[in-house]
C-alpha cells in the first residue's frame, strides 16, 4: 500500500486529481493543468506545480504575485511547458510568440526573443542560496541548533538527502541555506534541489503544497522561527546569457 492508497489522495501535492484507476485499482493521481501522472511518494516537479497553479481558477489563487523582493525570478509566474518527465523545457514561449531560455528551476536565463530563439539544452541550476530574514526575537538563535533544525526540515519535510544541504549560515537576523547538487550527483529518484527549494518557498509564504499536513511550524528549541523576507538566488552550471544592455540597466 502507499501513503496515497488509504483514501486516494496525494499527500505530497494537493494540486492533483486522484482516482483508483491505476493498475489493480491502485490510487493514481494526476497534476492539474497538465494531466500528468505524479508520484505521490516524492515531491512533484516545480514545472508541473507551476502549470497546475496557472490552471487554477483565478479567484481560487491567493498571493499569486511574486514577492516584491524576488530579485532573481523577477518574471514571476508563467504557464510553463514541461517535458514528459515533468521538467521545464529549455525554451519557453508565451501566447504572443515571445520566447526565452530557462534553467532547470524555470528561471529565465537569456534575453527574450521570438520563435527563432534556440535553447540547445536545459541548463542545470546546481547551487541555490536561500536568504531569509527572521522576525525579531528576544535573542539570537543558537547557530548549531538552527543548523540542525533546518537540515532536519529539508531531510524530513522535503525528502532532500542531507548531502545536498551544503551549509547553513547565520548572522542575526539573516539565515542563508545553501543547496548544492551537480548533474553527476543527482540520480533517478532523488529529490531535486530546485523542487525542494520551491516547496520550502511556498511553505514560507503560507501556501503549503502538501495535502492534509499542517502548515510549516519552524521552531528552534521551542522558539518559533518566523520568516519576514525571503530571497532565492540561483546559480547555473553554465552562466546565463544576457545582453550588456540588460546588465547596465
Amino acid at each position: 500500500h502507499t501513503a496515497a492508497q488509504d483514501n486516494c489522495t496525494c499527500p505530497t501535492n494537493k494540486m492533483t486529481v486522484c482516482s483508483p484507476d491505476g493498475p489493480g485499482g491502485r490510487c493514481q493521481c494526476r497534476a492539474l493543468g497538465s494531466g500528468m501522472a505524479v508520484d505521490c511518494s516524492t515531491l512533484t516537479s516545480k514545472c508541473l506545480l507551476l502549470k497546475a497553479r496557472m490552471s487554477a481558477p483565478k479567484n481560487a489563487r491567493t498571493l499569486v504575485r511574486p514577492s516584491e523582493h524576488a530579485l532573481v525570478d523577477n518574471d514571476g509566474l508563467y504557464d510553463p511547458d514541461c517535458d514528459p518527465e515533468g521538467r521545464f523545457k529549455a525554451r519557453q514561449c508565451n501566447q504572443t510568440s515571445v520566447c526565452w531560455c530557462v534553467n532547470s528551476v524555470g528561471v529565465r536565463r537569456t534575453d527574450k526573443g521570438d520563435l527563432s530563439l534556440r535553447c540547445d539544452e536545459l541548463v542545470r541550476t546546481h547551487h541555490i542560496l536561500i536568504d531569509l530574514r527572521h522576525r525579531p526575537t528576544a535573542g539570537a538563535f543558537n547557530h548549531s541548533d538552527l543548523d540542525a533544525e533546518l537540515r532536519r526540515l529539508f531531510r524530513e519535510r522535503y525528502r532532500l538527502h542531507p548531502k545536498f544541504v551544503a551549509a547553513v549560515h547565520y548572522e542575526q537576523p539573516t539565515i542563508q541555506i545553501e543547496l548544492r547538487q551537480n548533474t553527476s550527483q543527482k540520480a533517478a529518484g532523488d529529490v531535486d534541489i530546485g523542487d525542494a527549494a520551491y516547496y520550502f518557498e511556498r511553505d514560507i509564504k503560507g501556501e503549503s503544497l502538501f495535502q492534509g499536513r499542517g502548515g510549516l511550524d519552524l521552531r528552534v528549541r521551542g522558539e518559533p522561527l518566523q520568516v519576514e523576507r525571503t530571497l532565492i538566488y540561483y546559480l547555473d552550471e553554465i552562466p546565463p546569457k544576457f545582453s550588456m544592455k540588460r546588465l547596465t540597466a
Epitope: 502507499t2 501513503a3 511518494s41 531531510r155 524530513e156 519535510r157 538527502h161 542531507p162 540520480a187 533517478a188
Partner: nanobody, 123 residues
Framework: QVQLQESGGGSVQAGGSLRLSCVVS????????MAWFRQAPGKEREGVAG???????TYKPSVEGRFTISRDSAKRTLYLQMNSLKPEDTAMYYC?????????????????WGQGTQVTVSS
Amino acid sequence: QVQLQESGGGSVQAGGSLRLSCVVSGYTTTRYSMAWFRQAPGKEREGVAGIDTDVLTTYKPSVEGRFTISRDSAKRTLYLQMNSLKPEDTAMYYCATGTGNFLALDPVWYNTWGQGTQVTVSS
C-alpha cells in the same frame, strides 16, 4: 511488483533483544532507501530508523543507541537489531522502501510496505 516480508518479531522481557529482518523482492534497481516503522494500538505509525543507498542512517531519538539498522544489498535484506527493549517499544513493526536516495522517517515518502511483525515487550 516489489514485495517486502518481515520476520523476527516475538515476545521478550524488558531489557532483552530481538533482531528483525525484511527481505525485499521484485526491485529492478538497488537505488532505494529503506526504513523501519512501528504502530502501537490506537497510535499513529511512526518512523523508527532509516537507511539510504550509501548506508547512512537516521533514528528516532528515543531508540538511538539501542536500535541499529543495517542492510545487506547482496541478500536484499534489511535488519533492525533492537537491544535494551522497553515496554513502550511494543508495537507492530513494518519494513518500508522508497525509490531514490534519501534519509527520512516520514511514512509519506515510502511507497512499498510489508505486512508487519509483532514485537511485545513485557515488564
